[in-house]
Interface confidence: medium
Amino acid sequence: MGVEGCTKCIKYLLFVFNFIFWLAGGIILGVALWLRHDSQTTNILYLQLGDKQAPNTFYVGIYILIAVGAVMMFVGFLGCYGAIQESQCLLGTFFTCLVILFACEVAAGIWGFVNKDQIAKDVKQFYDQALQQAVVDDDANNAKAVVKTFHETLDCCGSSTLTALTTSVLKNNLCPSGSNIISNLFKEDCHQKIDDLFSGKLYLIGIAAIVVAVIMIFEMILSMVLCCGIRNSSVY
């Protein structure tokens, strides 16, 4: 005999919620695998200038994305299948996974906050190396794409550490079109914008993390309520 009333509502709510979660995980995993194997993005991730490699942050970033996608699919499947099958075992495993993920999120949040300066430094280093490659090997379209993405996303151009040769190239080729390049080069320093992103805009990342944490707590409560509902209904 299946669950009834309010518990049945929770069952389908949990199913829909986790189906979306599973789908999102699939998209993240798909995108991450595509990024990992696409030649253009592989070149960006493995940007080199001489013997200098792009920071490990980006190399590791893809694998973190793959892991996140896989875990989301797995947890989503447990929630979906556990809810629809009314399996206490699957729902219990789902609850345990959520607790572990919640702990991981808290740990990641603390680590990110503590290491935000190092992450910002890595991002700046990545920008500098992409910029160097775009100048030295102007056939490196991936490097140019990275530089232009930085410039357009952060609305900046160059940095105060530039050499004259790089400045020449930026002025003529890589700065956002329609911008006052001269003032942009010196006022809209990309290094400064990256620092601002990791200090001034940190609250946005915090809000996103809190939203995810609330959803996880909400799912934990639903899975526990459903689990108890299944146990109670099996008694009768």
């Epitope: 200038l49 001489g50 200098k52 500098d128 910029l131 160097q132 100048v135 030295v136 090997d137 102007d138 056939d139 530039l162 050499t163 004259a164 040769l165 790089t166 400045t167 020449s168 190239v169 002025k171 003529n172 080729n173």
Partner: antibody, heavy 123, light 110 residues
Framework: EVQLLESGGGLVQPGGSLRLSCAAS????????MSWVRQVPGKGLEWVSS????????YYADSVKGRFTISRDNSKNTLYLQMNSLRAEDTAVYYC????????????????WGQGTLVTVSS | QSVLTQPPSASGTPGQRVTISCSGS????????VNWYQQLPGTAPKLLIY???NRPSGVPDRFSGSKSGTTASLAISGLRSEDEADYYC??????????FGGGTKLTVLG
């Protein structure tokens, strides 16, 4: 041996055109920025133009802008300078040179030079 | 008129130490590295010093470069007769691109 060899110089009338070539040997032209520099006999060096490894970035001295065109054919390991609307003041020995770029994109000068080709603009 | 100023001539006797200066502004020499060239009579220029003070392979250590503020210097110690040549300083300026100094004619006396 790393070498650059210019050709195409000669006598031309004012308003005329000339195309200089610079053949590279001993290195892959496509890996380097290249430049043209000229020198009026008995005078100093004057930079004319620079071109990046795949022709994305091109720069000219104000004195030749709109009249001269720098280009390259990496498959032929050759650099070119198309000179139009020539004037008497363009008379000089034209050198092609390889540009050296260091770490952090520092311009480290012109490290390989050709022997030069004389261009004389006279009626 | 070159934006990098060099003395038109310099001289010294064999074995002596000679210094050639190159002065510019904060926008060219002040914020960029300087390169030096030697042009022996009837030949193409040759890169002598790059990045303020580095010597390409094959250049004797008698030649040294330095830069302080908006002035760069090329020093030649133990002067030899074969050092008689024209010497040029050069920088890449973000506005005027490659900029050469007017050149200094070095004469080895006696």
């Amino acid at each position: 041996e790393v070498q650059l060899l210019e050709s195409g110089g000669g006598l031309v009338q004012p308003g005329g055109s000339l195309r200089l070539s610079c053949a590279a040997s001993g290195f892959t032209l496509g890996s380097y920025w290249m430049s043209w520099v000229r020198q009026v006999p008995g005078k100093g060096l004057e930079w004319v133009s620079s071109i990046s490894s795949s022709s994305s970035y091109i720069y000219y001295a104000d004195s030749v802008k709109g009249r001269f065109t720098i280009s390259r054919d990496n498959s032929k390991n050759t650099l070119y300078l198309q000179m139009n609307s020539l004037r008497a003041e363009d008379t000089a020995v034209y050198y092609c040179a390889r540009q050296r770029i260091g770490d952090l994109v520092v311009h480290y000068g012109l490290d390989v030079w050709g022997q030069g080709t004389l261009v004389t603009v006279s009626s | 008129q070159s934006v990098l100023t060099q003395p038109p001539s310099a001289s010294g006797t064999p074995g002596q130490r000679v210094t050639i200066s190159c002065s510019g502004s904060s926008s060219n020499l002040g914020s960029n590295t300087v390169n030096w060239y030697q042009q022996l009579p009837g030949t193409a220029p040759k890169l002598l010093i790059y990045g303020n003070s580095n010597r390409p392979s094959g250049v004797p250590d008698r030649f040294s470069g330095s830069k302080s503020g908006t002035t760069a210097s090329l020093a030649i110690s133990g002067l030899r007769s074969e050092d008689e040549a024209d010497y040029y300083c050069e920088v890449w300026d973000s506005d005027s691109y490659v900029t050469f100094g007017g050149g200094t004619k070095l004469t080895v006396l006696g």
